[in-house]
């Protein structure tokens, strides 16, 4: 029997200082550019090498960004989200959701990766 794939979802507050080339990551998503089915949220699609986000080390590709400086990113057009990031100032506070894939053993068997163990 095949194991099932579960996800461990965690949230984190990440404070970045804008670098010489900005925040150092790319985003996808928005109400007009859904990245995940039935989800118009904003996601990190790329971390720029040696950019602000990479040097901080906590933000990961695939993370969902829930808010910027306390401002919710729900139901935003893609460009509106981009503008919000670009105008967020020098010190930027991000509320992010990490989604870690956890491979469990077969049903009825608690595998090593099972977070409930």
């Amino acid at each position: 029997m095949n194991g099932r794939v579960d996800y461990l979802v965690t949230e984190e507050e990440i404070n970045l200082t804008r670098g010489p080339s900005g925040l150092g990551f790319n985003i996808v998503g928005g109400t007009d550019q859904q990245y995940v089915s039935n989800d118009s949220g904003i996601y990190v699609s790329r971390i720029k090498e040696n950019g602000a986000a990479a040097l901080d080390g906590r933000l990961q590709e695939g993370d969902k960004i829930l808010s910027v400086n306390g401002q919710d990113l729900k139901n935003l057009l893609h460009q509106d989200a981009v503008d919000l990031f670009r105008n967020a100032g020098y010190a930027v506070s991000l509320r992010v959701q990490h989604r870690l894939q956890v491979q469990n053993g077969p049903i009825g068997h608690r595998g090593e990766g099972d977070p409930s163990g």
Partner: nanobody, 126 residues
Framework: DVQLVESGGGLVQAGDSLRLSCAAS????????MAWFRQAPGKERDFVAT????????NYADSVKGRFTISRDNAKNTVTLQMNSLQPEDTAVYYC???????????????????WGQGTQVTVSS
């Protein structure tokens, strides 16, 4: 496998026009920022133009503003570069490049792009 394939290069006279095309496969094209770069012999790879995911936002190098136009067709997974009033200094290998999402750090540095085509030669004779 991601593939970017350029076409449309060639040898033209100064003042002529060329239209370069880049066909993308293996990516969800509509999520990608696309760009054109060029590299003359013995020179660095230089930014030419970039276009956002929807085609609503474009950016050009000063040297090509008013002469070159970048556009995209998300239904056909293609990005084009219309080049008018070509000059001998436009001679170079032209590369199509792509990166997922919209950059919050910059889009004119070759290091900002993950995927590249093999290039197409454009030669402008005087």
């Amino acid at each position: 496998d991601v593939q970017l394939v350029e076409s449309g290069g060639g040898l033209v006279q100064a003042g002529d026009s060329l239209r370069l095309s880049c066909a993308a496969s293996g990516i969800t094209f509509r999520w990608y920022t696309m760009a054109w770069f060029r590299q003359a012999p013995g020179k660095e790879r230089d930014f030419v133009a970039t276009i956002n995911w929807s085609g609503s936002d474009t950016n050009y190098a000063d040297s090509v503003k008013g002469r070159f136009t970048i556009s995209r067709d998300n239904a056909k997974n293609t990005v084009t570069l219309q080049m008018n009033s070509l000059q001998p200094e436009d001679t170079a290998v032209y590369y199509c490049a792509g990166v997922p999402g919209t950059s919050l750090s910059g889009e004119t540095d070759p290091r900002d792009y993950d995927y590249w085509g093999q290039g197409t030669q454009v030669t402008v004779s005087s």
